[in-house]
């Protein structure tokens, strides 16, 4: 008889993240027997559809067809047929569509639903497509990354080395920043949460954590730069605007309509002389961070201690893993490096801002100009952010790492959605481990 | 804006490989499906196959599969396309184009690239 | 493979109605998403996108170009029809990769 390679005892789950800017597919891999086990589960694929985030298909919902067709199929090629029709498909979409429900439920729910509609043609186990909520966005953010540093386990991490080596269970905040929210999760030391909106209680794996988390909708990168252009622009004595954020020598036409768009820079609306002004970069760091604290506010705080906004923020604890947006931006700069201090940070911010665009051009000719030209702005804002906003110091950013992925997964809040779906982290830790039957006829 | 540029016009001889190069300015290559498309004098548009530069996955269509070969190169944001065991027949105009990207309206197309088989 | 048929020419007078037709075998319907494009091409220029998903105007096209047709069976119409619309029009499918079909020469009399 003829020696036959088992079939592997795997399973596979789908999460699609439909963010404000794009959406992407990731495709989770994990032995059937150790369900329960910490630091089992693995990204085996990433597909970045392509196109803009979903919102932006209100008015030809007819194209999302189109747009997910490619890592669906993807999906299909990657994962074994035998396994399609018991692979759960979740898709979860975050701040991009609150705003978008914000305007009008009804748009919204009308592109969830012809993105359901797409979703259920295709062979696997598809479990619905929803806005989560920014609680969610960084529980689940927190878990990911706490998960893949094996945090959750007192027992040995099926992989050898864990970046970010620390020898306790202390657990790391997750810090995620995204086109239109931004997300700070952690568990405090022995603080009260004084606000109950920002509390979670998990038990996982035997052990309970209080955490800490609030999302800051409109405080993503792209919501920020929206905020910052119709605060400045309410001051500009034409339509010339004259900005620090970007590189001398930039120029764009915005149009006040585009402007006006998105209820997050509805504080700041007027009405304008004008239907359009141009952005003349003048890129001057200091400057540009100057604007940027002018959309925190920190004259009022009803707690012991807030971030911006009124919103209660308990003293930093342990360190971080800064990742999506965060990691992106200081990996384009070439600042992710942990032996790089704050101020070495801002000094090299400085310099970039301060280069010529046409010169910023020449140097990265394969980057999309739109994203380019916005470094400068989300560089800047990142350090604002965390400094102003999140009150890091300079001593204390040695404790944040910024992280694109852990052992191969993508850190973000995709694979703590998919675990928390499937029942995959238990409330108790597991008594003992199931031996592995795959060897064995 | 989007911008395609191919590279010059080529003489081969029956045998030779061509390499025809397209450079894109404006966005990053990763955010596109790249196709080749030729088409010989007086003659209609014919697909030859596209590269996704995100993955470096190829297809390419049935007639040209043990012939051609994309590739790209994302630190420079350009493609290639080889074709060898070239003959008179291959004598055509070889565009390079985008897919059109779900939520924007349009694709964008190189130039043309003139490459001329002959003895 | 997915086959387009058109047809291979057409003289019409400025101010009229012009039609072409694509038939493809088979369907390039997927999903309720209907995969057809046309394209204009004029001598010694590459293709120009003018409509997708058989109905949709493509960005700075004249209104007076529209795509009709679901399944097999489409139709690029030009109205009214202008001096500056001689060239050859192609239909292109994108359900299953790319296909062209052979091209319609549009003449103006």
């Known amino acids: 008889t003829q020696n036959k390679a088992l079939p592997e005892n795997v399973k596979y789950g789908i999460v699609l993240d439909a963010g404000s800017s794009h959406t992407s597919l990731y495709i989770y891999k994990w032995p059937a027997e150790k369900e329960n086990d910490t630091g089992v589960v693995h990204q085996v694929e990433e597909c970045r559809v392509k196109g803009p985030g979903i919102s932006k298909f209100v008015q030809k919902v007819n194209e999302i067809g189109i747009y997910l067709t490619d890592c669906m199929e993807r999906a299909r090629e990657v994962i074994p047929r035998s396994q399609h029709q018991e692979t759960p498909v979740y898709l979860g979409a975050t701040a991009g569509m609150r705003l978008l429900r914000m305007e009008s439920e009804e748009l919204a729910d009308r592109v969830l639903d012809v993105v359901e509609r797409s979703l259920s043609n295709y062979p696997f186990d598809f479990q619905g497509a929803r806005i989560i909520t920014g609680q969610e966005e960084g529980a689940y953010g927190w878990i990911t990354i706490n998960y893949l540093l094996g945090k959750f386990s007192q027992k040995t991490r099926w992989f050898s080395i864990v970046p970010y080596e620390t020898n306790n269970q202390e657990t790391f905040g997750a810090l995620d920043l995204g086109g239109a929210s931004t997300q700070v999760t952690f568990v405090p030391q022995n603080q009260t949460i004084e606000s109950p909106d920002n509390a979670l209680q998990f038990r996982l794996y035997g052990k309970d954590y209080n955490v800490y988390t609030h999302s800051f909708l409109c405080y993503g990168k792209d919501q920020a730069l929206w905020q910052k252009l119709a605060k400045d622009i309410q001051v500009a004595s034409n339509e010339i605007l004259r900005d620090p954020c970007f590189h001398p020598g930039y120029k764009k036409v915005v149009n006040v309509s585009d402007l006006y768009k998105t209820p997050c820079t509805k504080r700041f609306e007027m009405t304008l002389p004008f239907q359009q002004f141009e952005i003349q970069g003048i890129g001057n760091y200091q400057q540009c961070h100057q604007s940027i604290l002018e959309l925190f506010n920190t004259s009022y705080c009803p707690y012991s201690q807030c971030a911006f906004n009124g919103i209660f923020l308990p003293p930093l604890q342990g360190d971080f893993g800064a990742f999506s947006a965060f990691y992106f931006v200081m990996k384009f700069l070439n600042l992710t490096s942990e032996k790089v201090s704050q101020e070495k940070v801002t000094e090299m911010m400085k310099k970039f801002c301060a280069q010529p665009w046409e010169e910023i051009k020449t140097s990265y000719a394969g980057v999309k100009e739109k994203y380019l030209s916005e470094y400068c702005f989300s560089g800047t804002y990142i350090l604002s952010l965390l400094l102003q906003g999140y009150h890091f110091t300079a001593d204390s950013w040695e404790h944040i790492h910024f992280i694109g992925k852990i052992q191969g997964s993508d850190a973000g809040w995709t694979l703590g959605y998919m675990l928390n779906l499937t029942n995959m982290i238990p409330a108790e830790q597991p008594l003992s481990t199931p031996l592995s039957h795959s060897t064995y006829v | 804006q989007v911008q395609l540029v191919q590279s010059g016009a080529e003489v081969k001889k029956p045998g030779a490989s061509v390499k025809v190069s397209c450079k894109v300015s404006g966005d990053s290559i990763t955010a596109y499906f790249m196709h080749w498309v030729r088409q010989a004098p007086g003659k209609g548009l014919e697909w030859m196959g596209r590269?996704?530069?995100?993955?470096?996955?190829?297809k390419y269509a049935e007639k040209f599969k043990n012939r051609v070969t994309m590739t790209s190169d994302t630190s420079t944001n350009t493609v290639y396309m080889e074709l060898s065991s070239l003959r008179s027949e291959d004598t055509a105009v070889y565009y390079c184009a985008t897919e059109r990207v779900p939520g924007f309206e349009t694709d964008y197309w190189g130039q043309g690239t003139m490459v001329t088989v002959s003895s | 493979d997915i086959v387009l048929t058109q047809s291979p020419a057409l003289a019409v007078s400025p101010g009229q109605r012009a039609t072409i037709t694509c038939r493809t075998n088979?369907?390039?319907?997927?999903?309720?998403?209907?995969?057809m494009n046309w394209y204009q091409q004029k001598p010694g220029q590459p293709p120009k996108l003018l409509i997708y998903l058989a109905s949709s105007l493509a960005s700075g096209v004249p209104a007076r170009f529209s795509g009709s047709g679901s399944g097999t069976d489409f139709t690029l119409t030009i109205n009214p029809v202008e001096a500056d619309d001689t060239a050859n029009y192609y239909c292109q499918q994108s359900r299953n990769l790319w296909t062209f079909g052979g091209g319609t020469k549009v003449e103006i009399k």
């Open positions: 590269i996704d530069p995100d993955h470096e996955r190829t």
């Open positions: 088979p369907t390039v319907d997927h999903y309720g998403t209907t995969y």
